[in-house]
């Protein structure tokens, strides 16, 4: 029989009472197959991180510097519910740290460096960790001690709780620096004022303060954010332009064998019995012997975290960088305007090879990181183990999702002024061959279909979110009787038709036979009856274009368009029989990565785009015989964006709005965790 | 198709030097770019440095200053000079001309440098 027993872990001896009732009553609504509470009772928070590490206990809430210390080897601890506070319609687990200026003041996050500072409190989250952890590699050596440092870096501050002995400029703007509400600038609400009376030029706060200062919207506008990229945006643009989102108060467990779905049928049949006015007997969010005990007293509920979601990911990149800096306290040598190199997210081995070749021939330039699926490498460049990758339009939508943006786009067109100039989009189509003439668009149910991926636009998004409109319903396994969408799951039918060997059967890269617009057109080729490809597929693997065994001898005449009415096309009139056009891939990073990403490529793309002429004997960055790696091989340009640099802009409303309602049908697990985030 | 044949690994105590030659059986001359990977035991393959047809150079950060590659297009050899070894460059080290672009699965049988007291 599996042990149902939850060990929470207490670190006061209030908190072991309230566990030890919160056990009684539990016991006393729960069948006894169900999830049950035991108490361990430990001295401290780091002493309860090191007892779930360690198996003697499984479960305990934590505020997010210590979900950072769980996260840390050897702890290894993961998120797996959230505390919600608001309401359950609109429920916020997360906080955003942000800067606040007055609207005329003109100077940008880059720009801190002798100005006036307000804080909430030293050694608070967003009123000092997150800021000075932001701050730290600009503050002048040596950094420690910190305060220090941060008393030289700004012209005079109010840091409420700093010694105003040893630092008296943390205390200029309040004289005392006094640690209570009796310091008129202490914590948010006196952090804000210190910013409305004039005595500093920027505050340190979280994004609910200025409403729960400033009512009248009027007010609300003399104010701005200042944002990492060293914009401005107003107040409630928070989920922008932020220093970074915090989370409230997170239960953690172990990463591995660490009950998460136990942890979450307690929790979740705990706040169905005694959630907020639920039990006037037993209240979770209540600490009638103390303040927080267990659970925050502020909560209104739980959220069960996704489990795609590390802690890495739930606390987010500017949170632990601002962390891992004050911890760590190391920086590059000295701060210089010049780029690092580009670290490029490379899928699988193939994918890898390339990757080293571009970074041997750009001298530094270019490092590589690998991982095995498409989403792995967009949680890597999320969380700065990687900075960068070129995706199709779906996961553009995804990274997009995730907080990534759009840097470049690929063109696919020769023209005179390709760089300046990004193209509408490529077609989707549905290609089968000739020979099956019967074949049209109503009749594909029953048949063999060969997909890019699950996920990418022209082998997914867009078939299947015209088939979901028919349909309506997402079971695509049981409406084809069986296929290759490389990313589904193994026991699918639409794994049935892959040809990769072992483990690599149905992965969504290169080492899968059948992935991509080449794979998914072998797999019409060798197997299937409709492949969902882009309009150069075709072409571009016949005619002896492709000369691999499988491709040599095709020729294009043998196979047709499937078009939306019925009817059918040859291959040549793509613009005339499509499913949907489709946005062309995009190269994106991180926000903070943005300019030096643009740059860097540019520069890539001058030495080893098309301008060369011999491949065989020079690198070349957008060709790989017709296997797409890194970028598509029919590649021209890396093409600027303009004013379409975020991913609606770039995937315009049309396709967005495609996606979001295939979203009921997405088996993304990083989408989900993304907006779980962002919901 | 080029075949590459590296040589030159040893046992060889820390502090020590190793030169690994890779030879091919065909010109490299046209070879764009040249470069060794290297396996330790349980680990994945690794880039250790890099060489293009015009000499440019690139190390991993881990080889940086003891390691060198060069490349020497008349006898059709490229070399990887060790210095300094460390216990954690041991390792099966091979030698690949990327001039299959990037698809193949083939490599040489590679040589094991070994580097212990």
């Known amino acids: 029989v599996p042990d149902k027993t939850v060990r929470w872990c207490a670190v006061s001896e209030h908190e072991a009472t309230k566990c030890q009732s919160f056990r009684d009553h539990m016991k006393s609504v729960i069948p006894s197959d169900g999830p049950s509470v035991a108490c361990v009772k430990k001295a401290s928070y780091l002493d309860c991180i090191r007892a779930i590490a360690a198996n003697e206990a499984d479960a305990v809430t934590l505020d997010a510097g210590l979900v950072y210390d769980a996260y840390l080897a050897p702890n290894n601890l993961k998120p797996v519910v959230a505390e919600f506070y608001g309401s359950k319609e609109d429920p916020q687990t997360f906080y955003y740290a942000v800067a606040v200026v007055k609207k005329d003041s003109g100077f940008q996050m880059n720009q801190l460096r002798g100005k006036k500072s307000c804080h909430t409190g030293l050694g608070r989250s967003a009123g000092w960790n997150i800021p000075i952890g932001l701050l730290y590699c600009d503050l002048p050596e040596p950094r420690k001690p910190l305060e220090k440092a941060v008393a030289n870096f700004f012209s005079g501050s109010c840091a409420p709780c700093a010694d105003g002995t040893d630092f008296p400029q943390l205390c200029q703007l309040c004289p005392g620096c006094g640690c209570s509400t009796l310091n008129q600038y202490f914590g948010y609400s006196g952090a804000f004022k210190c910013l409305k009376d004039g005595a500093g030029d920027v505050a340190f706060v979280k994004h609910s303060t200025i409403f729960e200062n400033l009512a009248n919207k009027a007010d609300r506008d003399q104010y701005e954010l200042l944002c990492l990229d060293n914009t401005r945006k107003p107040v409630d643009e928070y989920k922008d332009c932020h220093l970074a989102q915090v989370p409230s108060h997170t239960v953690v467990a172990r990463s591995m064998g660490g009950k998460e779905d136990l942890i979450w049928e307690l929790l979740n049949q705990a706040q169905e019995h005694f959630g907020k006015d639920k039990s006037k007997e037993f209240q979770l969010f209540s600490s009638p012997h103390g303040k927080d005990l267990l659970f925050k007293d502020s909560a209104h509920g739980f959220l069960k975290v996704p489990p795609r979601m590390d802690a890495k990911m739930y606390l987010g990149y500017e949170y632990v960088t601002a962390i891992r800096n004050l911890r760590e306290g190391t920086c590059p040598e000295a701060p210089t305007d010049e780029c690092k190199p580009v670290k490029w997210c490379a899928l699988s081995h193939h994918e890898r090879l390339k990757c080293d070749e571009w970074s041997v021939n750009s001298v530094g330039k270019i490092e590589c990181v690998s991982a095995e699926t498409t989403e792995d490498c967009i949680a890597k460049i999320m969380n700065g183990e990687a900075d960068a990758m070129s995706l199709d339009g779906g996961f553009v939508y995804i990274a997009g999702k995730c907080g990534l943006v759009p840097v470049l786009a690929e063109n696919y067109n020769k023209s005179d002024n390709c760089e300046d100039t990004p193209e509408a989009g490529y077609f989707a189509i549905a290609v089968v061959k000739k020979s099956a003439s019967d074949l049209t668009w109503d009749n594909l149910k029953g048949k063999k279909s060969c997909h890019t991926a699950v996920g990418r636009t022209a082998g997914w998004n867009i078939p299947m979110g015209l088939l979901y409109n028919k349909i309506n319903h997402c079971r695509f396994d049981e409406f084809f009787s069986e296929g290759c969408a490389p990313g589904s799951k193994k026991d699918s039918s639409l794994c049935k038709l892959c040809m990769g060997s072992g483990l690599n059967l149905c992965e969504p890269n290169n080492k899968e036979g059948y992935y991509g617009y080449t794979g998914a057109f072998r797999c019409l080729v060798e197997k299937g009856d409709v492949a969902f490809v882009k309009h150069q597929t075709v072409p571009q693997n016949t005619g002896g274009k492709n000369p691999d065994p499988w491709a040599k001898n095709l020729n294009e005449k043998d196979y047709e368009l499937l078009c939306l009415d019925g009817t059918r096309k040859p291959v040549e009139e793509y613009a005339n029989c499509h499913l949907a056009r489709a946005p062309n891939h995009a190269v994106v990073t991180r926000k903070d990565k943005e300019a030096c990403v643009h740059k860097i490529l540019r520069q890539q793309q001058h030495l080893f785009g098309s301008n060369v002429t011999d491949c065989s004997g020079n690198f070349c960055l957008f060709r790989s015989e017709t296997k797409d790696l890194l970028f598509r091989d029919d590649t021209v340009c890396l093409a600027k964006l303009h004013d379409r640099n975020t991913y609606e802009k770039y995937l315009g409303e049309e396709y967005v709005k495609a996606v979001g309602n295939l979203r009921k049908c997405s088996t993304s697990s990083l989408l989900e965790a993304c907006t779980f985030r962002r919901p | 198709e080029v075949q590459l044949v590296e040589s030159g690994g040893g046992l060889v105590q820390p502090g020590g030097s190793l030169r690994l030659s890779c030879a091919a059986s065909g010109s490299i001359f046209s070879i764009a770019t040249m470069a060794w990977y290297r396996q330790a035991p349980g680990k994945g393959l690794e880039l250790v440095s890099g060489?293009?047809?015009?000499?440019?150079?690139n190390y991993r950060d881990s080889v940086k200053g003891r390691f060198t590659i060069s490349r020497d297009n008349s006898k059709n050899t490229m070399y990887l000079q060790m210095n300094s070894l460390r216990a954690e460059d041991t390792a099966v080290y091979y030698c690949?001309?990327?001039?299959?672009?990037?698809?193949?699965?083939?490599w040489g049988q590679g040589t094991l440098v070994t580097v212990s007291s």
């Open positions: 060489i293009t047809r015009s000499g440019s150079t």
């Open positions: 690949t001309d990327y001039s299959s672009r990037y698809y193949h699965d083939y």
